[in-house]
């Protein structure tokens, strides 16, 4: 088989026939050096999954539940292409599983016990697997058989396709539990009708069901959605209030050597030639000899899944939790109101060591998880492998786009009421050596630059955003002659100045000596012309305050700030000479962990925060000899956010807009993946 062949897996005679037709028609329109199709027939989707894992086939299209199976070891497959529905301008690749209730009913998600429930059908995604999976650990024991536990949880249900003889309560609201449209409460519309008629208190459906059944907004306003954080929202706010976000139909491939680019090339050309309304003789999204053969008949086209996206991220934390609960059936011993330990995400070895020290001192309240980059940490928090970390504003933006929420803000100024008063922010500045007297904001082209890291506020987003407005392109590596911007591509001139050895060169963590505020300033001291840092960086590393050999003899007076008007000022005049105000670093977590992270961190800072006077004899959370490990070293406390509890509100409209403008220059693979899930 030639290298450019994609071996498609078919699960029936009819699919194999369509696959052969697909192969033949592709041959007729694609040049001989282009991608081609071969067909492999297997007895089931699970056999297809195993065949792809064993390199006997390359691709198959799966529903969400099977994407989960495909991801599990030893299969280790990943999503590579998504079918979309709707229009090319507004492509829908996901649907949202929601819990709909009547507006005047006064209960929340955590008060569903004893209510009457309406389901689309037993074993169906939005109507059963997701809600019951998420409620699984609240079900009365024994939880097997599941139908019995569900029957004992709700006071009555309609779950079409259930066994009415063994589990009569599941058919109480729709006598007989018929498994077809003959049952008026079957399927999405049926489950909604069950709620509408007053038979049930809650209907588990998908987000579009309400719109399909109630054309009139006034009618829709009589209903609300139950959110997982025990609040309610209007039905049109399903993107912020759902049980899970579920991919509709997805092509999967091997994680390693999976031909994902070739599969995309093939399907992209296939949709050009044989997509919706393209060809009479062969149609990709049509199944004359059956239904949904190879692809869904209702699909309108394909979208490439961003390469950073593994199955866990693609399926989303809620969906994976629900399915894992149903499959594995494991729950904590007894659900308690006690918070579980917070799993803190630490970057590289230096942070991990400090985190471990914190963990030991916290007496079981903090556990540690390691990752190599900030983006890897954010991904781990998203999928539940970690719970929290403190982030620079630029990463708060990415984390927010990925569904995480800010929970506490670092405060840097001593005040009587530190924990109750989140600050306005710090200043992003451009520092130069006083001796380079001809250097100004207007003649930085061709100079050597030092950045905290790509994607960070003071070191990247603010200066590069301002620069982008001037030069109107993203080739910052051409603007500066060389520099160190950890997180840049290794062959970029913006890695040339970095000092990390071997694989650590230009890595966005403390293994790169020029990483972070102190690192960027060190880069200026030793090699660079300009450093983009925060206003406190120079005083914190001069006058003997940093004992490291490179810093111990430095003098603040030998450095100046570049002002945007082309002038220069002494370092202490940052308030009148800065690039912009930057939002303080903030702790982020998943929505479901928000309350516990808040509670435990407030306890921890009372034990190990700035009230500890002797850090040589005690563990200090906000100290790490100018290395800013886990938190900035100048943190005085972690402050409540009050109502600034979303990333947009926390960062502020101006900063969100600035980072949004710079998005076209973004090299963040995680941001690309997260905006795929939520454009």
């Amino acid at each position: 088989v030639p290298d450019k062949t994609v071996r498609w897996c078919a699960v029936s005679e009819h699919e194999a026939t369509k696959c052969q037709s697909f192969r033949d028609h592709m041959k007729s329109v694609i040049p001989s050096d282009g991608p081609s199709v071969a067909c492999v027939k297997k007895a089931s989707y699970l056999d297809c999954i195993r065949a792809i894992a064993a390199n006997e086939a390359d691709a198959v299209t799966l529903d969400a539940g099977l994407v989960y199976d495909a991801y599990l070891a030893p299969n280790n497959l990943k999503p590579v292409v998504a079918e979309f529905y709707g229009s090319k301008e507004d492509p829908q690749t996901f649907y949202y599983a929601v819990a709909v209730v009547k507006k005047d009913s006064g209960f929340q998600m955590n008060q569903l016990r004893g209510k009457k429930s309406c389901h689309t059908g037993l074993g169906r995604s939005a109507g059963w697997n997701i809600p019951i999976g998420l409620l699984y650990c609240d079900l009365p024991e024994p939880r097997k058989p599941l139908e019995k536990a569900v029957a004992n949880f709700f006071s009555g249900s309609c779950a079409p396709c259930a066994d009415g003889t063994d589990f009569p309560q599941l058919c109480q609201l729709c006598p007989g539990c018929g498994c077809s449209t003959l049952n008026q409460y079957f399927g999405y519309s049926g489950a909604f009708k069950c709620l509408k008629d007053g038979a049930g208190d809650v209907a588990f459906v998908k987000h579009s069901t309400i719109f399909e059944n109630l054309a009139n907004k006034a009618d829709r306003d009589q209903y609300e959605l139950l959110c997982l954080d025990n609040t309610r929202k209007p039905v049109d706010e399903y993107k912020d209030c759902h049980l899970a976000q579920v991919p509709s139909h997805t092509v999967v491939a091997r994680s390693m050597g999976g031909k994902e680019d070739l599969i995309w090339e093939l399907l992209n050309q296939a949709q050009e030639h044989f997509g919706k309304d393209k060809s009479k003789e062969f149609q990709l999204f049509s199944s004359p000899h059956g239904k949904d053969l190879l692809f869904k008949d209702s699909a309108h086209g394909f979208l490439k899944v961003p390469p950073r996206m593994d199955a866990k991220m693609y399926l989303g934390y809620e969906y994976v939790t629900a399915i894992r609960n149903l499959r594995e059936g494991t729950c904590p011993e007894a659900p308690t109101d006690e918070c579980k330990p917070v799993k803190w995400c630490a970057l590289s070895h230096h942070e991990r060591l400090k985190c471990d020290e914190w963990s030991v001192n916290s007496v079981g309240k903090i556990e540690c998880v390691s990752a190599e980059t900030t983006e890897d940490c954010i991904a781990k928090i998203m999928n539940g492998e970690a719970d929290a970390m403190s982030l620079d504003g630029g990463f708060v933006y990415i984390a927010g786009k990925c569904g995480l929420v800010p929970v506490l803000a670092e405060n840097y100024n001593k005040s009587d009421n530190c924990e109750d008063t989140p600050e306005a922010g710090y200043f992003a500045i451009a520092v130069v050596k006083k001796s380079a007297s001809d250097l100004t904001w207007d003649n930085l082209k061709g100079k050597k630059s030092c950045h905290t890291a790509v994607g960070r506020t003071a070191g990247w987003n603010i200066p590069m955003g301002l620069l982008y407005n001037k030069i109107n392109h993203c080739r910052f590596d051409e603007f500066f002659s060389e520099g160190c911007a950890p997180g840049s591509k290794k062959d970029s001139s913006l890695c040339k100045l970095c000092m990390g050895s071997g694989l650590n060169l230009c890595e966005p963590n403390n293994k790169e000596g020029y990483y972070g505020y102190t690192g960027a300033f060190r880069c200026l001291v030793e090699k660079g012309d300009v450093a983009f840092v925060k206003h406190q960086t120079v005083p914190q590393n001069t006058g003997g305050k940093n004992p490291d050999p490179w810093a111990k003899n430095l003098n603040e007076k030998d450095y100046e700030l570049l002002c945007l008007d082309g002038t220069r000022k002494p370092v202490e005049e940052y308030a009148n000479c800065h690039l912009a105000r930057a939002p303080n670093h903030a702790v982020v977590t998943r929505k479901d962990k928000e309350a516990c992270v808040h509670k435990i961190l407030r306890q921890q800072q009372h034990l190990f925060g700035s009230n500890v006077t002797d850090c040589s004899g005690n563990f200090c959370l906000f100290r790490s000899e100018t290395k800013d490990l886990l938190f900035r070293d100048d943190t005085v406390c972690l402050a409540k956010l009050h109502d600034r509890n979303t990333y947009e509100k926390y960062l502020g409209e101006e900063y969100v807009k600035a980072v949004g403008n710079l998005r076209k220059c973004s090299t963040s693979s995680l941001l690309e993946a997260c905006t795929f899930r939520r454009p």
Partner: nanobody, 112 residues
Amino acid sequence: EVQLVECGGGLVQAGGSLRLSCVASGSGFGINGVIWYRQAPGKQRELVALIKSDGYTNYRESVKGRFTISRDDARNTVWLQMNALEPEDTGVYYCKTPGVPFGQGTQVTVSS
């Protein structure tokens, strides 16, 4: 009340080995983990190695591969085996567990 006593320090030539012990009086020692610190003259106290109750260990970069921390819960003891010692390893070594004050420490001197 739990007290910690560190022993095993001494004068050793570069390249040599020492085995430090940290013995606790009283029960519940090290239930949340034990940390070895060191302090060189005129320098900040720094973490050298730690061991948690589940046996997980971690070390500062400069001692990785040379030092090994281990525990014997039956004897209420945590050990620090130090091999290939370097002059930079010189200092007073202390062990610590949450809620228990620092002991006197044990002096380690590595001559070149």
